[in-house]
């Protein structure tokens, strides 16, 4: 695993303990609250950022739903299994032994249940829609410049191919950016579009998960581009499964 | 076998404009690659101008940002460089090359073409 | 920007030899590092990218290590075809791609 050699810190996860101890006094860093040693070249997987983010727990996320497929997070914050390789667990079970199903971003599809609850699969989210409101500017921005910058931003600050980029639209003042990735279109390495997200979306916050970086500071030619709301949207390759009794509610 | 083929005037008088072209072959210039610039003054080392994904997507470098376009044309399966207002430190050896991963190293290139800058 | 320093900037050596050039970035940039080969009046060869991955076609006796700050490229055995000039380059995803200065392998 890699890290900043010179100072030992994780330049793209700041809620990492890092040391001098890897392979030939090679800097290493691990993952708060999991203790997982992180690859500090790419972003730390969603499921590592929100267990080590349970030390210091702050407001949940709160989704909304565009479709019938479309999943909310309406669980907020939870402390997750995660697997040897940072992904989310198919099963969730809290302390009192409530158990439910996970996406591969790690929001719930399906009712609560006991421990005899399974899981067979972790299914992935291949399509995650991501709607900002921005500040009043004196003009609309120009779309194309938009879709460059945000096309840049994914590609500069994320390392995600803008391949996984589908579609930017813009309807003044909402901006909304597609990202899709299907399970055949992901090679090793590539990051993924939950976790590029996931950073975003903190990034938007003026929550910056990246280390000595600064804040995100989203130009469109020269004009600053001042997010004050983010809904994320999320659809999975299998449908979600609530009862009818949920759906209704 | 991915080919790569520079092709423009080997002669711009100062304060000009650089035109060149690279050819594609082997190789779409619609696949999720990047395709870039990079020159080498003679003697010297090498130096990034910038590159171009095929939807239109640009990155340059800062230090040339000001005086640089490239461009693509997909009917043609080729990219172009143009570099305005040129000096004689412009002069150097030009190459294209295919830029592979998210953010490029270059795993395919061109011969490369020399442009002198005198008028 | 980040600046990429190269040493030596000139390297003799033998055939046979075990030869080892190094590069330093100015600041971290994971592994995302590139090894080419030049020689004369021809175009860069890529040789490894992300720090140690061989490319298609290139011999084994190349190899590359390190991450952060510190990169080495190692040739195990000397060939006479490996006399040329090798160059480090970054493409860490925020910082202009940057190349080391090179360094001359020449024959002893």
């Known amino acids: 695993h890699t890290a900043a050699q010179d100072n030992c810190t994780c330049p793209t996860n700041k809620m990492t303990v890092c040391s001098p101890d890897g392979p030939g006094g090679r800097c290493q860093c691990r993952a708060l609250g999991s203790g997982v040693a992180v690859d500090c070249s790419t972003l730390t997987s969603e499921c590592l950022l929100l267990k080590a983010r349970m030390s210091a727990p702050k407001n949940a996320r709160t989704l909304v739903r565009p479709n019938e497929h479309a999943l909310v997070d309406n669980d907020g914050l939870y402390d997750p299994d995660c697997d040897p390789e940072g992904r989310f667990k198919a099963r969730q079970c809290n302390q009192t032994s409530v158990c439910w199903c996970v996406n591969s971003v790690g929001v719930r599809r399906t009712d609560k249940g006991d421990l005899s609850l399974r899981c067979d699969e972790l299914v992935r989210t291949h399509h995650i829609l991501i709607d900002l409101r921005h500040r009043p500017t004196a003009g609309a921005f120009n779309h194309s410049d938009l879709d460059a910058e945000l096309r840049r931003l994914f590609r500069e600050r994320y390392r995600l191919h803008p391949k996984f980029v589908a579609a930017v639209h813009y309807e003044q003042p909402t901006i909304q950016i597609e990202l899709r990735q299907n399970t055949s279109q992901k090679a090793a390495g590539d990051v993924d579009i939950g976790d590029a997200a996931y950073y975003f979306e903190r990034d938007v916050k003026g929550e910056s998960l990246f280390q000595g970086r600064g804040g995100l500071d989203l130009r469109v030619r020269g004009e600053p581009l001042q997010v004050e709301r983010t809904l994320i949207y999320y659809l999975d390759e299998i449908p979600p499964k609530f009862s009818m009794k949920r759906l209704t509610a | 076998q991915v080919q790569l083929q520079e092709s423009g005037p080997g002669l711009v008088k100062p304060s000009g404009t650089l035109s060149l072209t690279c050819a594609v072959s082997?190789?779409?210039?619609?696949?999720?690659?990047?395709w870039s610039w990079v020159r080498q003054p003679p003697g010297k080392g090498l130096e990034w101008i910038g590159e171009?994904?095929?939807?239109?997507?640009?990155s340059y470098n800062p230090s040339l940002k000001s005086r640089v376009t490239i461009s693509v044309d997909k009917s043609k399966n080729q990219f172009s460089l143009k570099l305005n207002s040129v000096t004689a430190a412009d002069t150097a050896m030009y190459y294209c090359?295919?830029?592979?991963?998210?953010?490029?190293?270059?795993?395919?290139w061109g011969q490369g073409t020399l442009v002198t800058v005198s008028s | 920007d980040i600046q990429m320093t190269q040493s030596p900037s000139t390297l003799s050596a033998s055939v046979g030899d075990r030869v080892t050039i190094t590069c330093r970035a100015s600041?971290?940039?994971?592994?995302?590092l590139a090894w080419y080969q030049q020689k004369p009046g021809k175009a860069p060869k890529l040789l490894i990218y992300?720090?140690?991955s061989l490319e298609s076609g290139v011999p084994s006796r190349f190899s590359g290590s390190g991450s952060g700050t510190e990169f080495t490229l190692t040739i195990s055995s000397l060939q006479p075809d490996d006399f040329a000039t090798y160059y480090c380059?970054?493409?860490?995803?925020?910082?202009?791609?940057?190349f080391g200065q090179g360094t001359r392998l020449e024959i002893k």
């Open positions: 090359a295919r830029g592979s991963g998210v953010i490029s190293y270059f795993d395919y």
């Open positions: 082997g190789d779409s210039i619609s696949s999720h690659n990047w």
């Open positions: 171009i994904y095929h939807s239109g997507i640009t």
């Open positions: 600041q971290s940039i994971g592994n995302w």
């Open positions: 992300k720090a140690s």
């Open positions: 380059q970054q493409y860490d995803s925020y910082s202009p791609i940057t």
